[in-house]
């Protein structure tokens, strides 16, 4: 999917309002600095591509993120603000439903969510630079 035509401001608002809280809930006190950042992105569409990949594509050591609350909200946000996105996800959703949900939060999943937090930061910081705004913690 090409994320070029998404409404980036609306996606940013959704992230700050809800998705970020769910990611931090998932991390449960684990600090982002506990992990090295190995995934990066260079512009807004690229960031969303990487975010989608890390959120929804299972990896051998972390197969369960797609059913987490932050993933569901990420999917809803992308479907809402990226034209045609939901149509591209029908097959992926059907495949996801066939997988067993794993309840255990592994260290590798925490690391993956830490990477996601970094990607979201890059997405929003890139957005802020375009708007010439200064970020306040």
């Amino acid at each position: 999917y090409d994320f070029t035509n998404c409404d980036f401001q609306k996606i940013e608002a959704d992230y700050l309002r809800t998705i970020s809280k769910d990611l931090i809930t998932y991390m449960s006190g684990t600090k982002s600095t506990d992990f090295n950042n190995t995934v990066s992105c260079s512009n807004r569409p690229h960031c969303l591509t990487e975010i989608q990949s890390l959120t929804f594509n299972p990896t051998p050591r972390c197969a369960s993120l797609a059913k987490e609350m932050f993933a569901r909200k990420t999917k809803a946000t992308l479907a809402l603000w990226c034209p045609g996105y939901s149509e591209t996800q029908i097959n992926a959703t059907q495949a996801m439903k066939k997988r067993r949900k794993r309840k255990v939060t592994t260290n590798k999943c925490l690391e993956q969510v830490s990477q996601l937090l970094g990607l979201w930061r890059r997405f929003i910081r890139t957005l802020l630079k375009k708007q010439h705004h200064h970020h306040h913690h």
Partner: antibody, heavy 123, light 112 residues
Framework: QVQLQESGPGLVKPSGTLSLTCAVS?????????WSWVRQPPGKGLEWIGE???????NYNPSLKSRVTLSVDTSKNQFSLRLSSVTAADTAVYYC????????????????WGQGTLVIVSS | DIVMTQSPLSLPVTPGEPASISCRSS???????????LDWYLQKPGQSPQLLIC???DRASGVPDRFSGSGSGTDFTLKISRVEAEDVGVYYC?????????FGQGTKLEIK
Amino acid sequence: QVQLQESGPGLVKPSGTLSLTCAVSGDSISNYNWWSWVRQPPGKGLEWIGEIYHSGRTNYNPSLKSRVTLSVDTSKNQFSLRLSSVTAADTAVYYCARDAPSDYGDYGFFDHWGQGTLVIVSS
Amino acid sequence: DIVMTQSPLSLPVTPGEPASISCRSSQSLLHSNGYNYLDWYLQKPGQSPQLLICLGSDRASGVPDRFSGSGSGTDFTLKISRVEAEDVGVYYCMQALQTPYTFGQGTKLEIK
């Protein structure tokens, strides 16, 4: 708004145990914050003692680790510090502070502090 | 532990003039995510510390824009563009990269 309030004895005898509690209002201690203790000897700088998460996970300053115990009481929305085998060098103003996560999972930002309580170690 | 060193330790400033405080860490505070885990706090006389700057350069909520933070790696600077009487107190840098969090010795800013 978020407020933190330290309480406990202002005078502790040498070799005794210093016990302080930090009552939190305006925020649930079960939110995704770490809760820290920082101390400041009279006329000196700040020293981080340790931190606790609502689950009971802790991180301690290695220089004090053998003497420090942190605990949390979610039902009372408070957390506590115990420092054993105290000496005059432990005389300080003790602060509790909230370390709230940024929108990206960062910690290490003490955005709310208690007013501090002076603890004197003396016989 | 990461050692934090501030200079100067005392800083007399005339109101309206700029002020600058340096902070150096014994190891880099730059994380692989591209951000520096360095905070600045101000402790006004008789008060608790208050957060001014986090991540090296991000002003905390409600902090006047005359305060700015800069630097990367091991060398950081807090600048006040025009000092006001209410800015007096002790300024501390703190590394937030890893526990134990450690503070600089403090820089006492006073009005000339």
